[in-house]
Interface confidence: low
């Protein structure tokens, strides 16, 4: 959560001289309350936009727009504080619109916009517009808030942004998974154009159950340049347990741009028929950070083996 780096922050418009300032998120009207305060914004609109930074990176930004109510309180409106709260971290960023001239009623409703909050994929934010000065204690609130969920890197518009591309969003492994027999699973996928290793994470489940009955991790060493974009296949040995028949295969790449936090891709093979269900096994969290959409992996008390090939 940050401000777009190089844009001149402009809030002036015809009939209003205005400047945008960084804010500590604590306007002094909290400390020195005023008797007369403006009403709250009428509507807040938020949508996602993509902007370029001074370094040429494409980043997702929030486009925030709000309008004023058509009451006399605009005569006491001295500005606005925009606050964006990232819900999973409680990180907050604020800016202040400071009106350098008095607002007057004119023929159309006053409208303000701001498009400089840089956000992260797959994160939820609470956007608040607070009219200034803020109300006296126990006064009527003069702010409006709205939540906005930024799409993840699967979203077409997000896929081409720098944070998504650096997480590996442009790689499409086109995974195919085939059950060879009761004990072997063949996984095929397309390698990316980087000499990096991959990890295949196999988690098997009983039919209609979310507790795993087997898991196995297999490393694929970094391909040579001539193998880039080629198909690689791996044969995984399954646990020989009746009913342990639904297999989720997840491929985790380790691209240099995202290291152990790259986007994972998965495919699932369903059970052929309703089996018996074994005892559930507890969840765990691995040492790396799971990306959105990745599953937890499970403990296992059996052996698994695998081998792989690169196809030219």
């Amino acid at each position: 959560l940050r401000l777009l780096d190089h844009r001149a922050l402009v809030c002036s418009q015809p009939g209003l001289n205005c400047t945008v300032k960084n804010s500590t998120c604590l306007d002094d009207s909290w400390i020195h309350p005023r008797n007369l305060t403006p009403s709250s914004p009428k509507n807040i609109y938020i949508n996602l936009s993509v902007s370029s930074t001074q370094h040429g990176e494409l980043v997702p930004v929030l486009h925030v727009e709000w309008t004023l109510q058509t009451d006399a309180s605009i005569l006491y409106l001295e500005g606005a504080e925009l606050s964006v709260l990232q819900l999973n971290t409680n990180e907050r960023l604020c800016v202040r619109f400071e009106f350098l001239s008095k607002l007057r009623h004119h023929h159309r409703r006053w409208r303000f916009t701001f498009s400089h909050f840089v956000v992260d994929p797959d994160q939820e934010y609470e956007v608040t517009v607070h009219h200034l000065p803020k109300p006296i204690p126990d006064g009527d609130p003069n702010h409006q808030s709205k939540n906005f969920l930024v799409p993840d890197c699967e979203h077409a518009r997000m896929k081409v942004t720098t944070p998504c591309m650096s997480s590996g969003s442009l790689w499409d492994p086109n995974i195919t998974v085939e059950t060879l027999d009761t004990q072997h699973l063949r996984v095929d996928f397309t390698l990316w154009n980087e000499s990096t290793h991959y990890q295949i994470l196999l988690t098997s489940f009983p039919h209609m159950e979310n507790h795993s009955c087997f898991e196995h991790m297999h490393h694929i060493p970094a391909p040579r340049p001539e193998e880039f974009h080629q198909r690689s296949n791996v044969t995984l040995t399954l646990r020989n347990l009746k009913g342990c028949c639904r297999h989720q295969v997840q491929i985790q790449p380790f691209f240099s741009s995202c290291l152990n936090d790259c986007l994972r891709h998965s495919a699932t093979v369903s059970c052929p028929e309703m089996p018996d269900t074994p005892e559930p096994i507890p969840d765990y969290m691995p040492l790396w950070e799971p990306r959105s959409g990745s599953s937890d992996y499970k403990d296992d008390d059996d052996k698994g083996s695998s081998h792989h090939h690169h196809h030219h």
């Epitope: 971290t89 196995h216 290291l259 152990n260 790396w288 992996y297 403990d299 296992d300 698994g304």
Partner: antibody, heavy 118, light 107 residues
Framework: EVQLVESGGGLVQPGGSLRLSCAAS????????MNWVRQAPGKGLEWVSF????????YYADSVKGRFTISRDNAKNSLYLQMNSLRDEDTAVYYC???????????WGQGTTVTVSS | DIQMTQSPSSLSASVGDRVTITCRAS??????LAWYQQKPGKFPELLIY???TLQSGVPSRFSGSGSGTDFTLTISSLQPEDVATYYC?????????FGPGTKVDIK
């Protein structure tokens, strides 16, 4: 060069507090989960705490739960361990350690010594 | 919580000997196991991860095997510089427990 440097250790009385820091350099700190591991004098390694890359997952060993707090500041490439209500048995060398892709911890700091004594 | 045990707790062997250290988990952990070497006064160094994968830069005389609950670290030909304490560690789920260690020295 990939490097982790711990600081903040020292002598503290039982019941006191200390804050350890770990400065990371030479790699993209914000992409990695991190751990604190300690080693009491003449003893083995004891895992203390874990924090995921975006601080969304945090774990503690039972021996420190409720007394220690792990945190990180990705903007400053720093990992922290706030240690409160310190006990004699917390005396140890404290290491920060980075997990390797695929498993284990491949980068360790030199360690900082915490001595709890009256 | 899963307990990790190591045996032996210490051993003495001659230069060139084959040395085997075992690590046992009280419950299955698949191949989520690492081995570390710690020389006196130094920080630990990763030798093996994923039970059997040799960490880059580690001499090939070190090898790891096992899956589930029983794991082995083997030094095929003990060298003077291998004098150290060796630890196993599980990393399938928190707590990421270490074994108590095996101290290796030269006869």
């Amino acid at each position: 060069e990939v490097q982790l440097v711990e600081s903040g250790g020292g002598l503290v009385q039982p019941g006191g507090s200390l804050r350890l820091s770990c400065a990371a350099s030479g790699f993209t700190f914000s992409s990695y989960s991190m751990n604190w591991v300690r080693q009491a004098p003449g003893k083995g390694l004891e895992w203390v705490s874990f924090i995921s890359a975006r601080s969304s997952t945090i774990y503690y060993a039972d021996s420190v739960k409720g007394r220690f707090t792990i945190s990180r500041d990705n903007a400053k490439n720093s990992l922290y361990l706030q240690m409160n209500s310190l006990r004699d048995e917390d005396t140890a060398v404290y290491y920060c350690a980075r997990p390797k892709v695929g498993g284990g911890m491949d980068v360790w700091g030199q360690g900082t010594t915490v001595t709890v004594s009256s | 919580d899963i307990q990790m045990t190591q045996s032996p707790s210490s051993l003495s062997a001659s230069v060139g000997d084959r040395v085997t250290i075992t690590c046992r988990a009280s419950q299955g952990i698949s191949n989520y196991l690492a081995w570390y070497q710690q020389k006196p006064g130094k920080f630990p160094e990763l030798l093996i991860y994923a039970a059997s994968t040799l960490q880059s830069g580690v001499p090939s005389r070190f090898s790891g095997s096992g899956s589930g609950t029983d794991f082995t670290l083997t030094i095929s030909s003990l060298q003077p510089e291998d004098v150290a304490t060796y630890y196993c560690q599980k990393y399938n789920r928190a707590p990421f427990t270490f074994g108590p260690g095996t101290k290796v020295d030269i006869k």
